[in-house]
């Protein structure tokens, strides 16, 4: 059993038909020695008297708010939550597994540039009585600093006749150098609890693999006389680190059809104009990636060719 | 306790609005749920309002009821009524652990009838 | 989501004992609950969190189960313990939750 915060415990149960479970002793937060009771959540049933109750822990019954009484008085509270352990694996029951871009993949992170702010997001189906908390640091061993704020339902999505849930959070690294080599990971973790069941999810990752950047911005088209061809123009999304000259991204243009089956038309280019044919009803798209770093490329800025 | 009312007759299309009146506890403390049940049918949970005052729904309502709530009552609002509404509605208080919860407190029930 | 309860009938001597069982499509961990529903009533909470009692509940009822398999157990059979039974899920609103369809308990 250990403490997840002031008056909350985790009690740690291998789950299988018949186990013996946990015996674990509470001891009422009081200078009081005599009369006491104690009752479980809104039982008024009396389970034991005395400074310390002890129990055995098997199941989510067990689990739950102890509370221990004087003469009809509230002393203290400690609320038993349980993690599941199954065939030696803990139990994920509370995330889903998003499978991108492995199998087991229930935390997903993604930064926008090198400032060392980055955001995580997870996936539940789950939509009440659901708390989650979130740590990070860069390392595990020596950790150094890292802030997250609190995680938040970002999104809610329909699937069939289930709703999806999507939770974010942000992090700041406390002190970030943007242009220094990693070599120490990012780790975050994640306490979800689910009335009674708690669970944990962690990732490991340096921000140069989570890069991101944003679309780029400003993105035009200037017909070039006595042609088909156009040049199209962008800049570097305000997001992305700066200066440019060292932060720099690649590009990749894209002149699609109405149809999707109609053959791409595709331009890699280090500058932030190329010039491309459009054709009649097509548009033209730009992303950028890390120029020296394969990271994800960001997602499409397009424009109409008309 | 708490109470139904405003079950009646009506004809298909007839929006009614079904009224719980809960006394000795408060709703700000409490899970609430409506539950139907059709003659010699099971019990069907339509919607909950949470202690906060947060609505869910089952999938199969669709839009067709709503449920709010006052500092005393819970209404559930049905809002084009057709003869597979008739029923038997009960309105229930969460036993105040959670807000997806079981039922502890129940009222007598309010029958609706829609028929042409 | 499903909660399927079985049998949907039982028939049972007074003084003797009634197994109902209740099985969820997906497990609601111990988050069951059973009500006893008489005709013209409104249904009476018996058992929650899979095993505990409601209070004045006889201890000749017990519950038990967790995961997707549940058990209801009535035990030395009075003649008013007949009544429909109904197994409850409240894991969640969205991902599990809702009533079984009802089991008819007579006592001959």
């Known amino acids: 059993i250990w403490e997840l915060k002031k008056d909350v415990y985790v009690v740690e149960l291998d789950w299988y038909p018949d186990a013996p479970g946990e015996m674990v002793v509470l001891t009422c937060d009081t200078p009081e020695e005599d009369g006491i009771t104690w009752t479980l959540d809104q039982s008024s049933e009396v389970l034991g008297s005395g400074k310390t109750l002890t129990i055995q822990v098997k199941e989510f019954g067990d689990a739950g708010q102890y509370t221990c009484h004087k003469g009809g008085e509230v002393l203290s509270h400690s609320l038993l939550l349980l993690h599941k352990k199954e065939d030696g694996i803990w139990s994920t029951d509370i995330l889903k597994d998003q499978k991108e871009p492995k199998n087991k993949t229930f935390l997903r992170c993604e930064a926008k540039n090198y400032s060392g702010r980055f955001t995580c997001w997870w996936l539940t189906t789950i939509s009440t009585d659901l708390t989650f908390s979130v740590k990070s640091s860069r390392g595990s061993s020596d950790p150094q600093g890292v802030t997250c704020g609190a995680a938040t339902l970002s999104a809610e999505r329909v699937r069939g006749d289930n709703k999806e849930y999507e939770y974010s959070v942000e992090c700041q690294e406390d002190s970030a150098c943007p242009a220094a080599e990693e070599s120490l990971p990012i780790e975050v973790m994640v306490d979800a609890v689910h009335k009674l069941k708690y669970e944990n999810y962690t990732s490991s990752f340096f921000i140069r693999d989570i890069i991101k950047p944003d679309p780029p911005k400003n993105l035009q088209l200037k017909p070039l006389k006595n042609s088909r061809q156009v040049e199209v123009s962008w800049e570097y999304p305000d997001t992305w680190s700066t200066p440019h000259s060292y932060f720099s991204l690649t590009f990749c243009v894209q002149v699609q059809g109405k149809s999707k089956r109609e053959k791409k038309d595709r331009v890699f280019t280090d500058k932030t104009s190329a010039t491309v044919i459009c054709r009649k009803n097509a548009s033209i798209s730009v992303r950028a990636q890390d120029r020296y770093y394969s990271s994800s490329w960001s997602e499409w800025a397009s424009v109409p060719c008309s | 306790s708490v109470e139904e009312s405003g079950g009646r007759l009506v004809t298909p299309g007839t929006p009614l609005t079904l009224t719980c009146a809960v006394s000795?506890?408060?709703?700000?403390?409490?899970?609430m749920i409506w539950v139907r049940q059709a003659p010699g049918e099971g019990l069907e949970w339509i919607g909950i309002i949470s202690s906060s005052g947060n609505t869910y729904y089952a999938t199969w309502v669709k839009g067709r009821f709503t449920i709010s709530k006052t500092s005393t009552t819970v209404d559930l609002k049905m809002i084009s009524p057709t003869t597979e509404d008739t029923a038997t509605y009960f309105c229930a208080r969460g036993s105040g652990a959670y807000i997806s919860d079981y039922f502890n407190v129940w009222g007598p029930g309010t029958l609706v009838t829609v028929s042409s | 989501f499903e909660l399927t309860q079985t049998p949907s009938s039982v028939e049972a001597a007074v003084e003797g004992t009634v197994t109902i069982k209740c099985q969820a499509s997906q497990s609601i961990d111990s988050w069951l609950s059973w009500y006893q529903q008489k005709p013209g009533q409104p249904p009476k909470l018996l058992i929650y969190a899979a095993s505990k009692l409601a209070t004045g509940v006889p201890s000749r009822f017990s519950g038990s189960g967790s995961g997707t398999q549940f058990t209801l157990t009535i035990g030395d059979l009075e003649c008013a313990d007949a009544a429909t039974y109904y197994c409850?899920?409240?894991?969640?609103?969205?991902?599990?939750?809702?009533f079984g369809g009802g089991t008819e308990v007579v006592v001959v």
């Open positions: 409850q899920s409240y894991y969640d609103v969205n991902a599990g939750y809702g």
């Open positions: 000795g506890f408060s709703l700000s403390d409490y899970t």
